[in-house]
Interface confidence: low
């Protein structure tokens, strides 16, 4: 917003106008207009000779503007010479600009037909358990005037959840400076926002337009079970589709899968609607949509629709999801060499083959750098020649390996360590 | 939008669930929930033993998730062990999750009371001189169904100038698939935008909600005088202020200053409203606002309001805006030295003092680097010793310099040049 008092010089012609005289024979004026303005209107420099006499001044296009800068990139400078015979120290010239045709617009305003009542102020919310009282005030001028009385007015309260648009907001009308919103108006555990405007009551002698909206007020509705799906709505397109939507908290939707179920009559079987489309709704909710086919609206005019957790199942086949218990491992010394021996927990089914993975390493190495061997259905493994006077570690794991059976490796057995003997010097 | 078919696994518990068995005595399951979900709802792992028997599985908190990654930053891993005596190659376990309380919502939809008619399609604009015809179509399903008939519907057309908000848009109702907008609806030389939605007609047996809005259509209204102020509106607050606003093309406002003038009755004197507030309105227009005081609405119930060019004047006093004609300059040689002499155009008023500014320079210098002298009421100046065999230039300008008189320097005189004589060598 910019403010200008009546009389403020603001046009480019007036801003740029400069007039100098030689105090003998003439006045020279320079000013500028803009190319953009000239497309729409031409203005003429006017000299007021006295209270009644306005004289147009003839001006030519000019190449420069030596006396003032033009505040616009596409200025059109002009220069005008006004012959003048007499100069007195008290002389003042009055210059203005006049458009090349009458410009303006006019309106006759009958006050009773052009009323915009004052906007509600001090909009506040107070709570009484699960009811919410909106109150506001409206300034009707001095009480003695009585031109606009409370009976001329009504109030339009619109309210919505924070995440919804005003276009879809609900409306309440009130003929007092308050309105009550109860559980029938509000969804639980939601943040609401409301605003109010003043309207002229239908029976009033006055007409015009509503006030501006009041500033908004926010509040949290009555607490409720936030895990429940909310705002289930269904609308029939009049042809063949019943479109339903509902909302779920994002955190709940991450743990519980909801479906839309419907019956075209109370005694029909329940069916699940598919596909479900999802969209984010603010930061807290997800809105879900699904379209139910309506093959015969004339026969089945009432649908029972529900949102329920879906029994979404995971099917896990035992024989391909086996993880055996880890083997138990021992280390034995056979003469100069070492062997690893292990046992698996007895399985009820002896036809299932086992694959073993054996790792052994020096104490100074990591399992990542260990030696790894894979054996089929074996329960022992002779180790190759090892370094003397060294601590070693070994571990083993098992998995099933027969066609038709699968799974993942068992956990590793408990790791076993042993020290190899020192070698006697040969002297 | 995301799409999910009924049955798609989408919850985090189901995504993360992995179960492995030792094919002998037990099944071990691991899964995760989120801290955020737990605040609102707890879910339990359920094993379906057969078609009718669902068994909850007891699970403990776990420190890790070795079998799957959790797609959420705040996961809570769990581990469950299910004893199991018998394993067969055809065994399949069915696992699901169940919330800790009944969740869901239910709606009985009577189709006739939950109708949202289809949105208008193919919205188009055509022109006939200064009238504009909006046409559209609406799909009502197969003709033989007759469930929703054209008589059940009406259309809400809203239209506005591009720069206005939909909240302030005008509304037209139509019971056919077209609407005509004429000069009485549209301001000239403006770009308009319209949209349409389908509503249930007041006399219909059906209820519900309007359709979505159609896509928008744009057009340019009939041409007009774009320099004219437009959209003058005034509204009385019912107390003491008549608020008026009007719009002007930005280019016009840069050259013509408009004011708001008012009379509280036809025979009252016209007054100008102040202050005027301005705001941008799109890229082409400026909206102006002013508030007219209404001291006595009961007595003066009709105001005549007009927007007109203001005679914004610039007052220019002759005696302080003098620019004399440039002097005429000559150079004379007096013996070995040079003098500058000048004359000013004869002024009618001899009592006005003159100040002269004289500049002289060598041919090789610029005026910026010249010697400058200032003299009062003089008409000549002797030059100091100059370099021999050198071309010099001089110029002079004049301004008034008496108390009560002011102005700006004249233009420079025509510059004069001369060559100094060479000096004979002394031998």
């Amino acid at each position: 917003w910019e403010r200008s008092l009546a009389g403020a010089e603001e046009t480019i012609p007036l801003q740029t106008l400069r007039c100098y005289n030689d105090y003998t024979s003439h006045i020279t004026c320079r000013w500028a207009d803009t190319q953009d303005a000239q497309r729409l209107v031409n203005v003429t420099l006017i000299r007021r000779v006295n209270e009644d006499l306005l004289e147009p001044v003839s001006c030519d296009l000019s190449d420069d503007m030596p006396w003032s800068a033009c505040p616009h990139p596409r200025c059109v400078p002009r220069r005008c010479v006004i012959p003048c015979q007499s100069f007195v120290v008290t002389d003042v010239d009055y210059f203005s600009f006049q458009p090349d045709r009458p410009l303006g617009t006019r309106l006759t305003v009958t006050l009773t037909q052009h009323v915009q009542p004052p906007e509600p102020r001090d909009l506040q919310i107070s709570t009484d358990q699960d009811h919410f009282l909106l109150t506001w005030s409206v300034a009707l001028g001095s009480p003695q005037s009585h031109w606009l009385s409370p009976g001329d007015l009504e109030f339009e309260v619109v309210y919505k959840r924070l995440q919804d648009s005003w276009e879809d907001a609900a409306i309440l009308l009130s003929n007092t400076s308050q309105a009550t919103l109860g559980p029938e108006h509000l969804m639980p555990s939601s943040t609401y926002v409301a605003r109010v405007r003043t309207r002229l009551a239908p029976g009033s002698r006055l007409s015009g337009r509503p006030s501006k909206w009041s500033p908004e007020v926010c509040w949290d509705s009555q607490p409720g079970d936030e895990a429940q799906p909310q705002n289930l709505e269904c609308f029939f397109d009049g042809a063949a589709v019943l479109s339903c939507s509902w909302e779920v908290r994002k955190e709940v939707a991450s743990s519980v899968s909801f479906g839309l179920f419907y019956k075209p009559s109370p005694d029909a079987g329940e069916e699940e609607c598919s596909p479900v489309l999802r969209e984010g709704l603010g930061s807290l909710h997800t809105r879900h949509h699904c379209q139910i086919p309506v093959p015969d609206p004339a026969t089945h005019g009432q649908y029972i629709v529900s949102v329920q957790p879906r029994r979404a199942e995971k099917h896990i086949k035992s024989s391909v999801n086996i993880q055996m218990a880890p083997p138990s491992l021992n280390v034995t010394k056979d003469g100069d060499s070492y062997s690893l021996r292990w046992e698996t927990m007895k399985m009820r089914y002896e036809h299932i083959d086992h694959t073993f993975e054996i790792q052994y390493r020096k104490d100074t190495a990591t399992w990542k750098d260990s030696k790894t061997e894979t054996l089929q259905n074996a329960h022992s493994m002779a180790l190759p020649a090892l370094e003397p006077s060294t601590r070693y570690w070994a571990r083993v794991r098992v998995r099933t390996s027969r066609t038709g059976y699968n799974g993942i490796w068992s956990e590793w057995s408990e790791a076993r360590s042993w020290d190899t003997e020192s070698v006697l010097p040969m002297w | 939008w995301e799409r999910s078919l009924a049955g798609a696994e989408e919850t985090i518990p189901l995504q993360t669930l992995r179960c492995y068995n030792d094919y002998t005595s037990h099944i071990t399951c691991r899964w995760a929930d989120t801290q955020d979900a737990q605040r609102l709802v707890n879910v339990t792992l359920i094993r379906r033993v057969n078609e009718d028997l669902l068994e909850p599985v007891s699970c403990d908190l776990s420190d890790d998730m070795p079998w799957s990654a959790c797609p959420h930053p705040r996961c809570v891993p769990r581990r469950c062990v299910i004893p199991c005596q018998s394993f067969v190659v055809t065994d399949v376990d069915y696992f699901s999750f169940q919330p800790d309380r009944p969740l869901g919502t239910r709606l009985t939809v009577t189709l006739t009371q939950h109708v949202q008619p289809p949105e208008p399609r193919d919205l188009q604009i055509s022109t006939d001189q200064d009238h504009f015809l909006l046409t559209w179509s609406v799909a009502l399903g197969s003709p033989q169904s007759h469930w929703l008939s054209p008589g059940d519907l009406e259309f809400e057309v809203v239209y506005k100038r591009l720069q206005d908000s939909w909240e302030d848009a005008a509304i037209l109702l139509s019971n056919t698939s077209q609407a005509t907008l004429g000069p009485e609806h549209l301001m000239p030389s403006s770009t308009y935008v319209a949209r349409v939605r389908t509503r249930l007609a007041p006399g219909s047996r059906l209820s519900g909600r309007p359709s979505k809005w159609s896509p928008e259509v744009c057009w340019d209204s009939q041409p007009g005088d774009e320099a004219q102020p437009q959209n003058l509106e005034c509204f009385f607050d019912g107390a003491a202020v008549l608020s008026c606003s009007w719009e002007v093309r930005k280019e016009v406002a840069s050259s013509v200053s408009f004011g708001l003038f008012y009379k509280p009755s036809p025979d009252a004197g016209e007054e100008e409203c102040s202050p005027v507030l301005r705001e941008g309105l799109g890229s082409l227009h400026t909206r102006h606002h002013c508030q007219i005081p209404v001291p006595d609405p009961a007595t003066h119930g009709q105001y005549i309001v007009s927007v007109q060019p203001r005679r914004a004047e610039k007052h220019i006093k002759s005696s302080v805006n003098i620019q004399m004609a440039p002097p005429s300059l000559n150079v004379t040689k007096d013996g070995d030295s040079y003098s500058l002499r000048w004359e000013t155009m004869k002024m009618r008023y001899e009592h006005i003092d003159h100040t002269f500014e004289i500049q002289y320079r060598k041919d090789t210098a610029t005026w910026k680097d010249s010697k400058t002298e200032t003299l009062q009421n003089a008409h000549s100046m002797a030059l100091p010793a100059l370099e021999p065999s050198t071309r010099y230039w001089a110029r002079v300008r004049v301004r008034t310099s008496r108390t009560g008189y002011n102005g700006i320097w004249s233009e420079w005189s025509e510059a004069r040049s001369w060559d100094t004589e060479s000096v004979l060598p002394m031998w």
Epitope: R3, A139, P215 | P275, H289, Q291
Partner: antibody, heavy 122, light 107 residues
Framework: EVQLVESGGGLVKPGGSLRLSCEAS????????MNWVRQAPGKGLEWVSS????????YYADSVKGRFTISRDIAKNSLYLQINSLRAEDTAVYYC???????????????WGRGTLVTVSS | EIVLTQSPATLSLSPGERATLSCRAS??????LAWYQQKPGQAPRLLIY???NRATGIPARFSGSGSGTDFTLTISSLEPEDFAVYYC?????????FGGGTKVEIK
């Protein structure tokens, strides 16, 4: 030049009274909503009182209600604040401020005076 | 009453740096919030009104944003004359209230 100049501050004992003046020049004070805002030494700003351009609307902060009175003299183009029953916590620089929106009454302040200091001390 | 909390209390920055000042309302004030600058010994000066509109004559380096309860004043590149105390003010509800101020000082 458009400006506001406050005067009338000074040292006063608890329970005492003062009348602060604010003289406007360069604009018509009665065309604007006018306000008093104060600032205790080294502290932030506190709104005190407002008078709408129509004069029919006057507002006060709870802390001064019943003790302070805002008024104006159209002929003198001046705004006043009569302050009675002064307390130590009323010690502050008192600024006169013009509303940004003229008779639209916007409740933001675009033109301020330099302030006048009121000290309440025994 | 609506309480406006400004943070930080003090911001130490060098000329040319970007300054971000915060103002939080105890309840929604929609976009009805202004920012002022005050230098020692001087009256406040209106910078921004209605959360994001620059007042007349205010340089483009000052910008405001936010609505509801959280608002920000940004000075894109600090000039020496920008070191001052900044206050926010709401007009959503009576009484009109100001924040406690943020002092922007030279580092």
């Amino acid at each position: 030049e458009v400006q506001l100049v406050e005067s009338g501050g000074g040292l006063v004992k608890p329970g005492g009274s003062l009348r602060l003046s604010c003289e406007a020049s360069g604009f018509t004070l009665s065309s604007y909503t006018m306000n008093w805002v104060r600032q205790a030494p080294g502290k932030g700003l506190e709104w005190v009182s407002s008078i709408r351009s129509s004069s029919s609307f006057i507002y006060y902060a709870d802390s001064v209600k019943g003790r302070f009175t805002i008024s104006r003299d159209i002929a003198k183009n001046s705004l006043y604040l009569q302050i009675n029953s002064l307390r130590a916590e009323d010690t502050a620089v008192y600024y006169c401020a013009r509303d940004y929106y003229g008779s639209g009454s916007y409740w933001y302040f675009d033109l301020w005076g330099r302030g006048t200091l009121v000290t309440v001390s025994s | 009453e609506i309480v406006l909390t400004q943070s930080p209390a003090t911001l130490s920055l060098s000329p040319g740096e970007r300054a971000t000042l915060s103002c939080r309302a105890s309840q929604s004030v929609s976009s009805y919030l202004a920012w002022y600058q005050q230098k020692p010994g001087q009256a406040p000066r209106l910078l921004i009104y209605d959360a994001s509109n620059r007042a007349t004559g205010i340089p483009a380096r000052f910008s405001g944003s936010g609505s509801g309860t959280d608002f920000t004043l940004t000075i894109s590149s600090l000039e020496p004359e920008d070191f001052a105390v900044y206050y926010c003010q709401q007009r959503s509800n009576w009484p009109l209230t100001f924040g406690g101020g943020t002092k922007v000082e030279i580092k």
